[in-house]
């Protein structure tokens, strides 16, 4: 950066090098160049010479004033016009930053995705700060009082093996940058209550043409959790509104769910599950598309294609005509 240059004087910022966006700031430049009484001192921002709001304070020092500074980052340097020098002489440079103190982190959520071996904690960080902001996740055992801290810039994965203070914990998030510090409320968790079953997948669909045609959706999960509650939502791709069916599920075998659907229409299906009575749902599964047959008296078996959407930490799912994220508490 510009701060690595060799200086013949120095440059400083008031109130500070990192300051709140929208503030009035002053940048001072003081020359210390051998055999040079500067005729003029110049300021440059991102390589462009500034022409206004420059005040000469004394023989060696000048001030540049900015009102309502709104740029997140700028590289400043100043130069001197020395007698008997054809070119301007570089005095010094500094990178400056503006931004905001962090908001109070809220919506702190911790879940354990089955088989992951990790507890994943996320939160809403609030408005963009524009400056480097670090987050410290505190995990404190309600049984032993031992506290672990984890430094991160976004979410955190904490190995469940490191949670050796029993099953009950408090989790809170501390946000800090050069402009301030804030802290979330404390979230109380029980490790057994935050497990999300392993992903549920719709594998195939089958339409049986009878007097009333019937579609069977086959779906499964590798979960070892015994009591699981699931929801399957479905709609015609041309519709805005979802229909939802609820199931109490035992995944010792592949699930088969029956639907009576309109003929010759393309449908979208998604499923999600939770451990019965617990807080958190899976994200909705990848969209599964199935077109029902026209009403012809025969049996057809058909595997329909999956859409290869990302089904990562937060999964986008089509709701009422816009994208929503659905792995929150119900």
């Amino acid at each position: 950066g510009i701060t690595n240059i060799n200086c013949s004087g120095h440059i400083w910022v008031e109130p500070a090098t990192i300051f709140k966006m929208g503030m009035n700031i002053s940048i001072y430049c003081q020359a210390a160049i051998k055999n040079c009484q500067p005729r003029q001192l110049h300021f440059y921002k991102n390589g462009i010479k500034e022409r206004f709001e420059i005040t000469r304070i004394n023989k060696t020092t000048a001030r540049l004033w900015y009102k309502n500074f709104l740029e997140p980052h700028a590289s400043m340097y100043c130069t001197a016009e020395c007698p008997n020098h054809f070119q301007e002489t570089l005095i010094c440079g500094k990178d400056i930053s503006s931004g905001y103190p962090p908001d109070v982190p809220d919506e702190v959520t911790c879940v354990i995705y089955e088989y992951s071996g990790n507890m994943t904690c996320t939160w809403n960080a609030g408005k963009l700060t524009y400056v480097d902001t670090k987050y410290v996740v505190h995990v404190k055992s309600l049984e032993t009082e031992e506290e672990q801290q984890y430094l991160t810039s976004s979410y955190i994965n904490i190995s469940t093996d490191s949670l050796q203070g029993g099953k009950k914990y408090l989790v809170w998030v501390q946000a800090e940058n050069a402009l301030g510090m804030e802290e979330s409320k404390q979230l109380q968790i029980h490790l057994d209550d935050i497990v999300i079953p392993s992903a549920s997948i719709i594998s195939r669909a089958e339409t049986i043409n009878a007097t009333v045609p019937k579609t069977i959706i086959y779906w499964d999960s590798q979960t070892t959790i015994e009591k699981v509650s699931c929801e399957m939502r479905y709609k015609a791709t041309t519709n805005q509104t979802w229909n939802v069916k609820e199931f109490d599920t035992n995944f010792t075998y592949v699930q088969q769910s029956e639907f009576y659907l309109e003929p010759n229409i393309k449908y979208i299906f998604q499923v999600r599950c939770q451990e019965t009575g617990k807080r958190y749902w899976q994200a909705w599964s990848s969209p599964f598309f199935h077109k029902t047959t026209e009403t012809v008296p025969q049996v057809t078996s058909k595997s329909s294609q999956h859409n290869t959407w990302n089904s990562g930490l937060t999964v986008a799912s089509i709701s009422t005509g816009h994208l929503t994220s659905d792995n929150r508490e119900d």
Epitope: V136, E147, Q148, Y150, L170, E183
Partner: antibody, heavy 121, light 112 residues
Framework: EVQLVESGGGLVQPGGSLRLSCAAS?????????MCWVRQAPGKGLEWIGC?????????YYANWAKGRFTISRDNSKNTVYLQMNSLRAEDTAVYYC????????????WGQGTLVTVSS | IQMTQSPSSLSASVGDRVTITCQAS??????LAWYQQKPGKAPKLLIY???KLAAGVPSRFSGSGSGTDFTLTISSLQPEDFATYYC??????????????FGQGTKLTVLG
């Protein structure tokens, strides 16, 4: 058994600075732990100054009255925690204790013997 | 979080049952400790996690409470128990607005 020994106390003029040391033995310095500073003015109650948390990263916490004037740091190679006190005032006259449980809990099983700081002209 | 301890002073006799209370300004779960301090000495941990007895502390000392209201009880006062007692919240110190984590103290003196 954890042992804490404070040093560095003494007489200092108002506006002056002082650095107190707390040498610790018996702590596993590779584990997570809190080391805290507490003071007690003559005839008064216990007053928390701040703590340093040492784990996968280092964090410091201060009472809001101590922010800006007091700084806690540590030197792992010397198993020592420091309290740097600046712009001292007469009301900072107190016995200063370091305290810990040798782990990442915030109650204090172990206390130093205390070191007296007197701020006076 | 503010810790309010009461009473600030208390006179009692050997053999008496004594109760000291401590109130937190917000929920601190069971994260509360009690200390005993004698003149010229460092404080000594008596109780942690609201009700757990520290090593070497006589069983006549007991603690109770959770959330915001806590109690230290000495079931039968002994001569060596006359001292000053402090409560301390041990929930979290990362909050930017903490002034003190200790209560103001309760001075227990001999009656008469």
């Amino acid at each position: 058994e954890v042992q804490l020994v404070e040093s560095g106390g003494g007489l200092v003029q108002p506006g002056g600075s002082l650095r107190l040391s707390c040498a610790a033995s018996g702590i596993d310095f590779n584990s997570n732990y809190y080391m805290c500073w507490v003071r007690q003015a003559p005839g008064k109650g216990l007053e928390w100054i701040g703590c340093i948390y040492v784990g996968s990263h280092v964090n410091t916490y201060y009472a809001n009255w101590a922010k800006g004037r007091f700084t806690i740091s540590r030197d792992n190679s010397k198993n020592t925690v420091y309290l740097q006190m600046n712009s001292l005032r007469a009301e900072d006259t107190a016995v200063y204790y370091c305290a810990t449980s040798g782990s990442s809990v915030l109650y204090f099983k172990f206390w130093g013997q205390g070191t007296l700081v007197t701020v006076s002209s | 979080i503010q810790m309010t301890q009461s009473p600030s002073s208390l006179s009692a006799s050997v053999g008496d049952r004594v109760t000291i209370t401590c109130q937190a300004s917000e929920n601190i779960y069971s994260f509360l400790a009690w200390y005993q301090q004698k003149p010229g000495k460092a404080p000594k941990l008596l109780i942690y996690s609201a009700s757990k007895l520290a090593a070497g502390v006589p069983s006549r000392f007991s603690g109770s409470g959770s959330g915001t209201d806590f109690t230290l009880t000495i079931s039968s006062l002994q001569p060596e128990d006359f001292a000053t007692y402090y409560c301390q919240q041990t929930n979290r110190y990362s909050n930017p607005d903490i002034y003190n984590v200790f209560g103001q103290g309760t001075k227990l003196t001999v009656l008469g």
